[in-house]
């Protein structure tokens, strides 16, 4: 059993039919000695008398708020939950596996530059009794500070018969260096608590493996005289890591005819132009990857041809 | 090539051959072997290998300032790698496909290394640390967390050239 | 299918030398390493020895004198010799295959039926 | 030589029931993070079949009450709900250093 903050706590069970489940014993946080009796959370069935009750949890049934009263007045609470250990493996009943870029994968996280901000996601199909909490460091055995705000429902979907919730956090590493190569790992732990269940899902990156710059900005089209080619333009995202002559991006641009049959042209560079042939109801669009790392492409920016 | 007492490399030069060591490592890692043990390994191999920290000056500031401390880390690094990619993880059981750019990867580390620092002047250089794989697998694994770790490396020593090509060149 | 075979002698005299071979199918001895594998009569198992894909060797260091391990990649065969047999080599002789180094850190995925040696005069 | 110490010797447990074997090394085996520590089922008469390689990945075609887990030095197997055909010595094996080592194996039996 642990403190997972004040009076709350979390018991780790071992999750198999018949399981002895663990023995905890809860004090009432009182000066008081006599006439102490304790019940579990709206019942009004005392479960024992003294300073201290000594339960076993082996099941959500004995999870809950516990309640150590004297003469009617409350004296305190610990609200115990429960941590499924089945087969060795922790529960992961609450987040729903996104399975990309692998499976387990449960929280998923992009940064637009090298500044040391970055965003995480994850998914369930829980509406109700959940929280989260979010803590997250550089590094782990001698860990640097990062800041990260509250989770936040950011979209609804329904997918099939379900309704899907998209919960994200911002966070901040709170002393980026942005020009330097990253030795230790950010580490990303996400809390989370349905009812009386406590899970925790922890993801673990490198700022540079998780970069997608936004799309380029600014995309237009030069007719060339006499030709059917035109000079598309385009400019690094405002988010991207300045000075852009040491953050550089390279560039795809892929003409892309109406139909998806179609063949696509593609074409790579590392500059801010290109000169492409504009087919009758094309359209063009380039998109952005870091120069030197090959981390994620931006989405793509696009125009029509004509 | 960067000379004692700190006169400027051909940054130039410098940046293409960094950027073709970039593509270079890319596209060596896939190469090494089908590799499900990367998902797992989850310990780093980042404690044994040099890196370009934050008080290095490599950062455009630190660049413009003086840029001899972060080409000599640089160096250090391209050695350091370049003895790791000659080296028993990478020569020994399973053996590289003969056409794997691991070669060429290894060869354009050496000639960067040597545009940096002219015969003749000697920077120190880090000991290759013992990273002793005994089995097949275990030299697999390596391979891949040098390779990445040679991956951001790389990018930063592209980010500096191509950022001293730019502002740096006389 | 992946198949593994030993062959050899059942019996053998002590101080003889056993050779037993391994035939194996559905995969090249390019790409996998092979293993053999002991077990005395209601014993447990013993590693003696691998021979990897590009040809190297590593032995069990307790009876690496008397061991050899080749193969024939083109014949898809690796053989086993042990000199100087003594009575408490009597064992089932099993020829394995290593998984993919990428995948399986040295977990032997495919045994074959193993061949009984009696070393006995 | 890694040692590898297997408990208990022999097990007996009703069908349906939980069997959970342990093995522990003299020494750790891991490297990097990976765990090469690999479990195999021997039923009388026949080789050594591999249930689960890595500590905790299931090899294909292995029943799901079959799992692993551990790292270093102490693993476990578990088998979630014991069938009639699980009947069999299990052994532990690493292959992390040179010689490769196995347990002296876990005799299971129904109740």
């Known amino acids: 059993i642990w403190e997972l903050k004040k009076d709350v706590y979390v018991v780790e069970l071992d999750w198999y039919p018949d399981a002895p489940g663990e023995m905890v014993v809860l004090t009432c946080d009182t000066p008081e000695e006599d006439g102490i009796t304790w019940t579990l959370d709206q019942s009004s069935e005392v479960l024992g008398s003294g300073k201290t009750l000594t339960i076993q949890v082996k099941e959500f049934g004995d999870a809950g708020q516990y309640t150590c009263h004297k003469g009617g007045e409350v004296l305190s609470h610990s609200l115990l939950l429960l941590h499924k250990k089945e087969d060795g493996i922790w529960s992961t009943d609450i987040l729903k596996d996104q399975k990309e870029p692998k499976n387990k994968t449960f929280l998923r996280c992009e940064a637009k530059n090298y500044s040391g901000r970055f965003t995480c996601w994850w998914l369930t199909t829980i509406s109700t009794d959940l929280t989260f909490s979010v803590k997250s460091s550089r590094g782990s055995s001698d860990p640097q500070g990062v800041t990260c705000g509250a989770a936040t429902l950011s979209a609804e979907r329904v997918r099939g018969d379900n309704k899907e919730y998209e919960y994200s956090v911002e966070c901040q590493e709170d002393s980026a260096c942005p020009a330097a190569e990253e030795s230790l790992p950010i580490e990303v732990m996400v809390d989370a608590v349905h009812k009386l269940k406590y899970e925790n899902y922890t993801s673990s990156f490198f700022i540079r493996d998780i970069i997608k710059p936004d799309p380029p900005k600014n995309l237009q089209l030069k007719p060339l005289k006499n030709s059917r080619q035109v000079e598309v333009s385009w400019e690094y995202p405002d988010t991207w890591s300045t000075p852009h002559s040491y953050f550089s991006l390279t560039f795809c641009v892929q003409v892309q005819g109406k139909s998806k049959r179609e063949k696509k042209d593609r074409v790579f560079t590392d500059k801010t132009s290109a000169t492409v042939i504009c087919r009758k109801n094309a359209s063009i669009s380039v998109r952005a990857q870091d120069r030197y790392y090959s981390s994620s492409w931006s989405e793509w920016a696009s125009v029509p041809c004509s | 090539r960067a000379v004692p007492g700190g006169s400027s490399p051909a940054w130039t030069q410098c940046q293409q051959l960094s950027q073709k060591l970039c593509t270079l490592a890319w596209s060596a890692h896939p190469l090494v072997g089908h590799m499900d043990l990367r998902e797992e390994g989850d310990e780093e191999t980042t404690n044994d290998v040099p890196h370009i920290q934050c008080g290095d000056g490599c950062d455009p500031q630190g660049l413009r300032d003086n840029s001899q401390f972060c080409l000599q880390r640089i160096h250090q690094g391209l050695i350091f790698y370049e003895k790791l990619l000659g080296s028993d993880i990478f020569t020994g059981e399973p053996s590289l496909l003969p056409d794997s750019p691991v070669g060429q990867l290894h060869a354009s580390l050496l000639g960067l290394s040597q545009l940096l620092q002219p015969e003749g002047h000697h920077w120190e250089t880090q000991q290759i640390p013992s990273l002793s794989p005994s089995q097949p697998w275990q030299r697999l694994l390596l391979r891949f967390k040098i390779l990445r770790s040679l991956q951001a490396f790389v990018a930063v020593a592209a980010r500096v050239f191509a950022h001293g090509a730019a502002t740096l060149s006389p | 299918q992946v198949t593994l075979k030993e062959s050899g002698p059942v019996l053998v005299k002590p101080t003889e030398t056993l050779t037993l071979t391994c035939t194996v199918s559905?995969?090249?001895?390019?790409?996998?390493?092979i293993s053999w594998v002991r077990q005395p009569p209601g014993k447990g198992l013993e590693w003696l020895g691998v021979i990897w894909t590009g040809g190297g060797t590593n032995y069990n260091s307790g009876i690496k004198s008397r061991l050899t391990i080749s193969k024939d990649n083109s014949k898809s065969q690796v053989v086993l010799t042990m000199t100087n047999m003594d009575p408490v080599d009597t064992a089932r002789y099993y020829c394995v295959r290593e998984g993919d180094y990428g995948s399986y850190a040295g977990a032997m995925d495919y045994w074959g039926q193993g061949t009984t040696v009696t070393v006995s005069s | 030589d890694i040692v590898l110490t297997q408990s208990p010797d022999s097990l007996a447990v009703s069908l349906g029931e939980r069997a959970t074997i342990n093995c522990r090394a003299s020494e750790s085996v891991d490297y990097y993070g990976i765990s090469s520590m690999h479990w195999f089922q021997q039923k009388p008469g026949q080789p050594p079949k591999l249930l689960i390689y890595?500590?905790?990945n299931l090899e294909s075609g292995i029943p799901a009450r079959f799992s692993g887990s551990g790292s270093r030095t102490d693993f476990t197997l578990t088998i979630s709900s014991l069938q009639a055909e699980d009947v069999a010595v299990y052994y532990c094996?690493?292959?992390?250093?040179?010689?490769?080592?196995f347990g002296g194996g876990t005799k299971v039996e129904i109740k």
């Open positions: 890595r500590a905790s």
């Open positions: 559905g995969f090249s001895l390019t790409q996998y390493a």
């Open positions: 094996q690493q292959a992390n250093k040179d010689p490769y080592t």
